[in-house]
Interface confidence: low
């Protein structure tokens, strides 16, 4: 007598969820008498799929009519594949009796269940940095069954390697999670900069995922500061202006001081931006030297994204400067933090 | 016929414990998750937990540690610890469907728990 | 653990009409989300689970649609039989946690 053979052709099967997986089973005999059930997982612990007595298995269907004479086909389909049904599947043989009694268990197919990571979500630092600082941002995909995946930055289109990428939990599991730091050097350049994290995986037909952070709500750069004479004009005014440059973000307020004394408070308000997504901006102040016996000391003051306030002095020497219309466009800078490096 | 039967509800004190016990027919308890719903007088259902079929239990972040899931072979039990009056529910025992773990398709009668002085 | 929030809280209406329940989540639960029946004095009876698929032997008037946060149940055409509360039920596969919606009671005008 042929001994019997329950053959699972397949050694693994792969789904994407929410199609249904059909797990093939042909036995090599009829005998001996007894049924056909399908476990998932081997040993004590083992969970029972589809029994045909029993009956109440709504999403497990045989494929051929398991009470026709001489059927020897005992595969099943399982509808509405979801990532919690992977595993490894087992036809097994019992010999009737009471109870039955296991006689043959398939080699088993493994179900893998193939579910899309959720976009990447990047996040990036709490609190602005400056050039030459490093800031990290974290990407983030979850739910996404097989384990493989592979994930990358790229900053501007290059490939970043400062990066570190977990991919949890470590053992078995119905879906997976995967967890990126990427590290990134702040350049003055990098307001119009973007940071990607691109997630490739089997389900995904070749096309990655992609999430986005932009480096401009990262990046602070700081002013400079420049204060300069104009001439003095008829009226025995002179027109000093403090140009501010190169700043991000455009949060940024100055003041005049004349003598140590507020003498003119405004905030920056749609400017212009410059190429490199910075902002300028230029302030007037006319002092009318008629009104001073003696020097007058001007300070432009700037106050840049809640930063401390930098300063930029000078005096206008009103000895230089006769009642009549003068030309003398120059005055002594008595500039401090004269360049605002914070 | 597949189907699950909870026992060992009753009146418990504040503060006592009690050791809740649900029994299968029709399927082994240790090829299923298996888990605890309870539904408080007039109220709407509550997970409590459940147990996986290698036996590793999960529970809703209310238990606080005062409810413990374990399974032997032919019952699943809950042991109740710390009882409080908002315990007082009926207690049901379910399965979780035999290939999806995201829901319950066998449920029990339901034992009662009053926790009363 | 996940908020699920069901709405209404109750409804009343004639033989025959559409009844639509809602569910969100507080979270996303892609498509893990379960509707049950109870019926007064009764135990829970599951109808739809993975959102829309239904259970054997339950009437094909009930369906279930929804996936991410937003789901919902709708009784074709409602049968004086269908008097119950109904309940949404979320799996989170990364917490492996459940989370039931406070109940919607369906009557009949």
């Known amino acids: 007598e042929e001994e019997l053979q329950v053959i699972q052709p397949e050694k693994s099967v792969s789904v994407a969820a929410g199609d249904s997986a059909t797990l093939n089973c042909t036995v090599s005999s009829l005998i001996p008498v007894g049924p056909i059930q399908w476990f998932r997982g081997a040993g004590p612990g083992r969970e029972l799929i589809y029994n045909l007595k029993e009956g109440h298995f709504p999403r497990v269907t045989p494929v051929s009519d398991p009470t026709k004479r001489n059927n020897m086909d005992f595969s099943i389909r399982i509808s509405n594949i979801t990532p919690a049904d992977a595993g490894t599947y087992y036809c097994v043989k019992f010999r009737k009796g009471s109870p039955d009694v296991e006689l043959k268990s398939g080699a088993g197919t493994e179900l893998s269940v193939r579910a899309k990571p959720s976009a990447p979500v990047v996040s990036g630092p709490a609190v602005r940095a400056t050039a030459e600082h490093t800031v990290s941002f974290t990407c983030e995909s979850h739910g996404f069954s097989p384990r493989d995946i592979t994930l990358k930055w790229f900053k501007n289109g290059n490939e970043l390697s400062d990066v570190q990428t977990n991919v949890d939990p470590a053992g078995k599991s119905v879906s997976y999670s995967i967890r990126s730091t990427a590290r990134v050097v702040l350049t003055r350049r990098d307001v119009h900069s973007q940071v990607i994290c691109e997630v490739a995986h089997v389900t995904l037909q070749g096309d990655p995922l992609r999430g986005t952070a932009n480096l401009s709500e990262a990046i602070r750069v700081p002013p400079f500061l420049e204060v300069t004479q104009q001439s003095m004009r008829a009226d025995n005014q002179v027109n000093v202006t403090c140009q501010v440059t190169k700043f991000y973000p455009q949060r940024l307020q100055l003041t005049w001081l004349e003598n140590g004394n507020v003498s003119r408070t405004e905030m920056a308000s749609a400017l212009p931006e410059n190429k490199d997504g910075t902002y300028n901006w230029t302030s007037w102040l006319l002092v009318n030297v008629s009104a001073h016996r003696d020097d007058v000391k001007l300070t432009c003051q700037v106050e840049h994204d809640g930063q401390p306030a930098v300063n930029k002095s000078f005096s206008v020497k009103v000895s230089a400067h006769p009642k009549e219309q003068g030309s003398n466009t120059a005055a002594e800078n008595t500039g401090t933090n004269e360049r605002n490096i914070y | 016929e597949v189907k699950v039967e909870e026992s060992g509800g009753g009146l418990v004190q504040p503060g006592g414990s009690l050791r809740l016990s649900c029994a299968a027919s029709g399927f082994s308890l240790s090829s299923y998750v298996m888990g605890w719903v309870r539904q408080a007088p007039g109220k709407g259902l509550e997970w409590v937990s459940i147990i996986s079929s290698s036996g590793s239990p999960y529970y809703a972040s209310w238990v606080n540690g005062r409810f413990t899931i374990s399974k032997t072979s032919t019952t699943m039990d809950l042991q109740m610890n710390s009882l409080r009056a908002e315990d007082t529910a009926v207690y049901y025992c379910a399965r979780v469907g035999p290939l999806g773990v995201d829901y319950f398709n066998i449920w029990g009668q339901g034992t009662t728990v009053t926790v009363s002085s | 653990d996940i908020q699920m929030t069901q709405s209404p809280s109750s409804l009343s209406a004639s033989v025959g009409d559409r009844v639509t329940i809602t569910c969100q989540a507080g979270?996303?639960?892609?498509?893990?989300l379960a509707w049950y029946q109870q019926k007064p004095g009764k135990v829970p009876k599951l109808l739809i689970y993975y959102a829309s698929t239904l259970e054997s032997g339950v009437p094909s008037r009930f369906s279930g649609s929804g996936s991410g946060t937003d789901f919902t149940l709708t009784i074709s055409s409602l049968q004086p039989e269908d008097v119950a509360t109904y309940y949404c039920?979320?799996?989170?596969?990364?917490?492996?946690?459940?989370?039931f919606g406070q109940g919607t009671k369906v009557e009949i005008k």
């Open positions: 039920q979320s799996w989170h596969y990364i917490s492996r946690s459940y989370a």
């Open positions: 979270q996303s639960i892609n498509s893990y």
